[in-house]
Every structure is written in structure tokens, then in C-alpha cells.
């Protein structure tokens, strides 16, 4: 058993049918010595008396808020949560496996630049009685500071018969140098509590591996005289690291017809302009990627050909 | 600010070209190592990230873009001093900081070259003959060093009398390649920046 926060305790259980469970001793936080009784949750049934209460925790029915009283007055509370270990592996019931970029990906994180700021998000089908708390650091043995905000519900989607909820959090490394070469990964730890179930999820990454630039901005077309060709120009996104000659991007320019089946013409360039043939009803899209370290491409920025 | 469209300074351009070749070569070699050594811990998540140049060179600090010198988190240690006769920059552009930066890059390349050559000698003794260093990558390191053209003491190639542990050697190869790829990215960024300055 360990303390998650004041008066909230996590009992780790080897989870299988007929498991013996864990013996837990609760102590009433009071100078009083006698006349103390214990109850669980809203029930008035007295579970025991005395300054300590010994219980055998086996299932969720044994978890909850234990309260010690004296003469009708509440002295203190202890909330017991359960953390299930199923055949040597901690349970992952609360969050959905996003399966990207690989199986067992519960947390996904992205950074728009090298400033040390990043966003993580996760999915769940649970709508109520759910709380998250997020901690992060650079490295784990001698951790350096990363500050995370509160996790917030950022999107709701309908997936088949189920509703899916997306939560996200923003974090910022306390002293980040955009040009630094990372040797210790960022660690992100999410504590999830649903009713009386506790779970924790972790992700470990280098900022360089989670970079996804914003789409190029100010995408414009300039028709070339006496030609079907157009000059496409764009700019680096405002959120990208500066100077741009050091943090350079490379670009992919795509001409896409109205029909998805039509052949796509693609051009790759390090410049912020390109000359392409604009077909009727087609659209031109441009996306960006770090020129020197191949992390994710940005989303497309698009303009119609007409 | 967009990348300049002006023709790059011919004095700088060879280094930019060589540094791009270097990144391509090390990335290819790392990919080959990850595929060939699939049963070894060779992915970024599995290896220890070691930097053989740590405390010996200070490339990131010495080559910091001017715009980032205001960022205190970037200014850890900039006291290392190096020889200052680099030939990549036209002399009129050679400033002390640029020379320091290019000299630091040269020292990095020299250290990795020695490590890779020593490692290749061991890998050539492996009866499995599973993986060797790409000669193209070694040649590209050499070309960039020549383009930088710094006079520096030659480091003797390490020789080991004991029987090599091929498993450990292959894991060390993965560690070296990951670190060298990261340094090659920095070198490419620096060359691009200097080329645009």
C-alpha cells in the first residue's frame, strides 16, 4: 500500500479469482484513543472499533472511503483505491490502446518545435468518475524539471456504438535549449483514477522524435504567363523554431485531382516555392518536415487550383 | 524568415554539401544496422545514449546560432578553445566563434573516425561476418574533415590485445551510430546556418 496523495492510498493486488488479497491496517488520524468506530462509504454499518482497523482487501467491494468516527463526529478519512496486477502486468482498463505508432500506445505526444513544449493526449470510453494527474521530467534517475498543466477533455467522438473521449495536457521543459542534443528522454507519467480503480501510464521519448511542424502558412498561387504552370509559394509556420536557416524544413508539394483515384503529382523541395502544373478542379497541398531529422510530416495546407 | 535564395558563398558550400552527404551516409548505416542486428537492442528506445565527445568538444555550444545566445539554457559551457585556421570559410568571414565551431566539428569527426575504424577492425574478425561499417560513410567523414582542413594531432587507432566480445561490439556500434547521427544533424544545421549567414 502506498499514498497517492493526502488520505488517498493505493492497494496493489495480484488480480485472479480466489486471490488472498492484501491485509491493510488503517489508523485513525486523531489523538483520541477510545470510543472510535469505523464505517465504509455511505454505509452506517460499523466495521470495527479502536484506533486501528485491519481489513483484508480482495475486491472492489473492499475499497472505498473508510471513515473513523467518535460520538457522531467524523475524525478522519482514508480512501482506498485498487491497482490490479494481472499476471505480472498492471491493468490498462481505463485508457484505449491507440495502436499508433505501435501496439500498447496509450499516450501519444507531439511537439510543434524544439522549444521543449509538447502536448500529450489519450483516449477513453469512460465518461464519468474519472480523474487524471500528469507528471513529467527529463530523465528518471536524476530528473530535470518539466511542468505540466491540468489534463482537460479536448474532444468527443462517436465510434460505432461508443462515445470516445480525448483528454490532453500541455507540458513545458523548464530549461530547454532548442539546439541541444538530447541524451536523456522526457518521461511522462499519467495517474488515472476511475471510481475506485487506479492505473498509471507512462511514455518516454525524445522531443526530436515527436516533432510535427504546423502546416506551412500563406500558401499562394501565382499563374505563370502563357502557361498551365503556377508558382506555388508558402512560408514557414509561425510556431516553427528559429532561426530557420538552422532549423530548416523540407517540403512536399502535391497536386491532387478532385477524385481520390486520380494520380497525385508530388515534388519535394527545400525552398519555399515550387512550379507545378495546375489541373482543372485540382488542389495544391504543401506539407513540411524537419529537413535533417525525419520525424512526422505536418498536416497539409491546401489551396484550390481555380 | 525564409531560407535565402541567394547563391551560397563558394567558400562555405563544399562543407554544406559534405555535411549533407554525411547525414545521408550515417542514416543509411544506422538503418542497415537496425535491420541486420534485429535481435540486438539497437533501437533508440533500447540503447543507452552516450556521447563519446562529451567533455572533449562542445560543438552545440560553440556552433550556437546568434539568435539562440540570448537563451540562457543554451549557454552552459562556451569556454573551450580550439585551433583557428579552418578553410571552409572564406577568410573575410572567419570569425573567432566560427573557427571555434568548425574546429569543434573537426574534432568530433576525428574522434568518431577513430572509434569506427577500431570497431570495424573488430567486426572484421567476427566469424559470423554479420555487419561491417559502410566504407562510403568512412569516406564521407574523411571528405568533410579534409574540407574543414584543420591541423590537428593525429589520434592513434586504438588496438586491443584481448579477444573482442562481438555481442558487445555490435551493441556499441548501435550506440555510436545513434550518437553520430544526432551529431550529424547538428553539423548539417550548423553548415546550413553558416551558409545562409
Amino acid at each position: 500500500i502506498w499514498e497517492l496523495k493526502k488520505d488517498v492510498y493505493v492497494v496493489e493486488l495480484d488480480w485472479y479469482p480466489d486471490a488472498p488479497g492484501e491485509m491493510v491496517v488503517l489508523t485513525c488520524d486523531t489523538p483520541e484513543e477510545d470510543g472510535i468506530t469505523w464505517t465504509l462509504d455511505q454505509s452506517s454499518e460499523v466495521l470495527g472499533s479502536g484506533k486501528t482497523l485491519t481489513i483484508q482487501v480482495k475486491e472492489f467491494g473492499d475499497a472505498g472511503q473508510y471513515t473513523c468516527h467518535k460520538g457522531g463526529e467524523v475524525l478522519s478519512h482514508s480512501l482506498l483505491l485498487l491497482h490490479k496486477k494481472e499476471d505480472g502486468i498492471w491493468s490498462t482498463d481505463i485508457l484505449k490502446d491507440q495502436k499508433e505508432p505501435k501496439n500498447k500506445t496509450f499516450l501519444r505526444c507531439e511537439a510543434k518545435n524544439y522549444s521543449g513544449r509538447f502536448t500529450c493526449w489519450w483516449l477513453t470510453t469512460i465518461s464519468t468518475d474519472l480523474t487524471f494527474s500528469v507528471k513529467s521530467s527529463r530523465g528518471s534517475s536524476d530528473p530535470q524539471g518539466v511542468t505540466c498543466g491540468a489534463a482537460t477533455l479536448s474532444a468527443e467522438r462517436v465510434r460505432g456504438d461508443n462515445k470516445e473521449y480525448e483528454y490532453s495536457v500541455e507540458c513545458q521543459e523548464d530549461s530547454a535549449c532548442p539546439a541541444a542534443e538530447e541524451s536523456l528522454p522526457i518521461e511522462v507519467m499519467v495517474d488515472a483514477v476511475h471510481k475506485l480503480k487506479y492505473e498509471n501510464y507512462t511514455s518516454s521519448f525524445f522531443i526530436r522524435d515527436i516533432i510535427k511542424p504546423d502546416p506551412p502558412k500563406n500558401l499562394q498561387l501565382k499563374p505563370l504567363k502563357n502557361s498551365r504552370q503556377v508558382e506555388v509559394s508558402w512560408e514557414y509556420p509561425d510556431t516553427w523554431s528559429t532561426p530557420h536557416s538552422y532549423f530548416s524544413l523540407t517540403f512536399c508539394v502535391q497536386v491532387q485531382g478532385k477524385s481520390k483515384r486520380e494520380k497525385k503529382d508530388r515534388v519535394f523541395t527545400d525552398k519555399t516555392s515550387a512550379t507545378v502544373i495546375c489541373r482543372k478542379n485540382a488542389s495544391i497541398s504543401v506539407r513540411a518536415q524537419d529537413r535533417y531529422y525525419s520525424s512526422s510530416w505536418s498536416e497539409w495546407a491546401s489551396v484550390p487550383c481555380s | 524568415r525564409n531560407l535565402p535564395v541567394a547563391t551560397p558563398d563558394p567558400g562555405m558550400f563544399p562543407c554544406l554539401h559534405h555535411s549533407q552527404n554525411l547525414l545521408r551516409a550515417v542514416s543509411n548505416m544506422l538503418q542497415k544496422a537496425r535491420q541486420t542486428l534485429e535481435f540486438y537492442p539497437c533501437t533508440s528506445e533500447e540503447i543507452d545514449h552516450e556521447d563519446i565527445t562529451k567533455d572533449k568538444t562542445s560543438t552545440v555550444e560553440a556552433c550556437l546560432p546568434l539568435e539562440l545566445t540570448k537563451n540562457e539554457s543554451c549557454l552552459n559551457s562556451r569556454e573551450t578553445s580550439f585551433i583557428t585556421n579552418g578553410s571552409c570559410l572564406a577568410s573575410r568571414k572567419t570569425s573567432f566563434m566560427m573557427a571555434l565551431c568548425l574546429s569543434s566539428i573537426y574534432e568530433d569527426l576525428k574522434m568518431y573516425q577513430v572509434e569506427f575504424k577500431t570497431m570495424n577492425a573488430k567486426l572484421l574478425m567476427d566469424p559470423k561476418r554479420q555487419i561491417f561499417l559502410d566504407q562510403n560513410m568512412l569516406a564521407v567523414i574523411d571528405e568533410l574533415m579534409q574540407a574543414l582542413n584543420f591541423n590537428s594531432e593525429t589520434v592513434p587507432q586504438k588496438s586491443s590485445l584481448e579477444e573482442p566480445d562481438f555481442y558487445k561490439t555490435k551493441i556499441k556500434l548501435c550506440i555510436l551510430l545513434h550518437a553520430f547521427r544526432i551529431r550529424a544533424v547538428t553539423i548539417d544545421r550548423v553548415m546550413s546556418y553558416l551558409n545562409a549567414s
Epitope: 495480484d14 488480480w15 485472479y16 479469482p17 480466489d18 486471490a19 475486491e59 472492489f60 496486477k85 494481472e86 499476471d87 505480472g88 502486468i89 482498463d93 505501435k102 501496439n103 500498447k104 470510453t125 | 535481435f39 537492442p41 533500447e46
Partner: antibody, heavy 115, light 112 residues
Framework: QVQLVQSGGGVVQPGRSLRLSCAAS????????MHWVRQAPGKGLEWVAF????????YYADSVKGRFTISRDNSKNTLYLQMKSLRAEDTAVYYC????????WGQGTMVTVSS | SYVLTQPPSVSGTPGQRVTISCSGG????????VKWYQQLPGTAPKLLIY???YRPSGVPDRFSGSKSGTSASLAITGVQAEDEADYYC????????????FGTGTKVTVLG
């Protein structure tokens, strides 16, 4: 004590369907994940499928994906395996099993796919 | 389809020490715990070892398990006639959990 009693096995022609049941008692069935495992005559153990305690997630072996469906009725304390488009290579003893470091197995039920 | 490899058979005389190996990889045994089962003819498998080296109550202490790196092994010290059976190791793969990965199985024969 924990008990898993299986039923529903038998002889079936290729291409036909069969449903296996596994009735649980002696524990809170709705709190635990469950597996199906099979063993072809004279062969080793092969995992078939898994279902979460609440039925929210199901996982299948590639060899049965799209043909077999694992399900559970927590109000009846019963686990099911619906098998469709049966093939000769599905012939095996099928076991249900609890998920956990200590597990409990059903007695097994024989499924024979033969024309 | 078996990723965990066991020797097809091992044998020993009563009282001898018999060991069965189970060889896997970094993503299965290297990352997860190992179980061992004993299966007597015509019966369901019985758990012998869980969590690499823990014995459930009721399992004789002549059975012991161990794990090192990407391999595990089951040892029977002082093998007895009633130990003649098939033995299977089981683990998970970190990418496909909770799918069970079983070993190929080993037939233990007690001679004499």
C-alpha cells in the same frame, strides 16, 4: 472454490458453426478476463481468444480472426466461443481459462471438424 | 507460429535433476514473466510456476523456475515417476498482450 464447466463440443462438418460455453462459479466472474485455449490431437497448446472482464475488448489469434467470436454474459456467469466456417484444422480440445498469475482451467471440450 | 522454443523431449532416471529450457526474444520473455504448466495425458494443464520463479501452494518444491534475459528454464530436482508428462512454458509479447504465447512443449520421460 473456483469452477469452470464447459459444454457445447461435438462433431461438426467443415463450414458449419458451433458454440462452446463455459459456466463459472465460486468467484466474481464479472471481475476477471477470460481466455480460450485449444490443443489439437497430439499437438501443443494454442491460444485462441481473450475477453476483458467487462467485454469491452476482445483479442483473437490470427488463425481464427473473422471466424470465431468470444463473448460473455456476466449476469449468467458464462463465457462463450461462437465458431463459424469451421475447418479440419480447428479440430482440438478447447479449454476456457481465467486470466491471472494463478489460473483455473475448464475440463476441456472436444471439437471435431470432419465430413 | 510458436515463438517460444523448448526441446521436444528430455529424460532422466528417478532422483536425477532434469531441466527444460524455453527460449524467446526481447519482446516476450525479455519483457514479461514466464509461467510453466504440467499436462498429464487427457487432463487440462496445471500451473507449476508463475512470475518466473514462484510456486503456487500445493506444487512440490522439487519444481523450480528461473529466467535470464530472453530464456527461462524449469528444473525438476529429484525427478519422480509421476512427473512424466508434457511441460509448457508461457509468456506474453509486449506488442500482442494479452495473447498467450506458449512454448512448443517438452515431453519428460522418467526412465527405469
Amino acid at each position: 472454490q473456483v469452477q469452470l464447466v464447459q459444454s457445447g463440443g461435438g462433431v461438426v462438418q467443415p463450414g458449419r458453426s458451433l458454440r462452446l460455453s463455459c459456466a463459472a462459479s465460486g468467484f466474481t466472474f464479472s471481475s476477471y478476463g477470460m481466455h480460450w485455449v485449444r490443443q489439437a490431437p497430439g499437438k501443443g497448446l494454442e491460444w485462441v481468444a481473450f475477453i476483458r472482464y467487462d467485454g469491452s475488448n476482445k483479442y483473437y489469434a490470427d488463425s481464427v480472426k473473422g471466424r470465431f467470436t468470444i463473448s460473455r454474459d456476466n449476469s449468467k456467469n458464462t463465457l462463450y466461443l461462437q465458431m463459424k466456417s469451421l475447418r479440419a484444422e480447428d479440430t482440438a480440445v478447447y479449454y476456457c481459462k481465467t486470466h491471472g498469475s494463478h489460473d483455473n482451467w475448464g475440463q476441456g471440450t472436444m471439437v471435431t471438424v470432419s465430413s | 507460429s510458436y515463438v517460444l522454443t523448448q526441446p521436444p523431449s528430455v529424460s532422466g532416471t528417478p532422483g536425477q535433476r532434469v531441466t527444460i529450457s524455453c527460449s524467446g526474444g526481447r519482446s516476450n520473455i525479455g519483457s514479461n514473466t514466464v509461467k510453466w504448466y504440467q499436462q498429464l495425458p487427457g487432463t487440462a494443464p496445471k500451473l507449476l510456476i508463475y512470475g518466473n520463479d514462484y510456486r503456487p501452494s500445493g506444487v512440490p518444491d522439487r519444481f523450480s523456475g528461473s529466467k535470464s534475459g530472453t530464456s527461462a528454464s524449469l528444473a525438476i530436482t529429484g525427478v519422480q515417476a509421476e512427473d512424466e508428462a508434457d511441460y509448457y512454458c508461457q509468456s506474453y509479447d509486449r506488442g500482442t498482450h494479452p495473447a498467450l504465447l506458449f512454448g512448443t512443449g517438452t515431453k519428460v520421460t522418467v526412465l527405469g
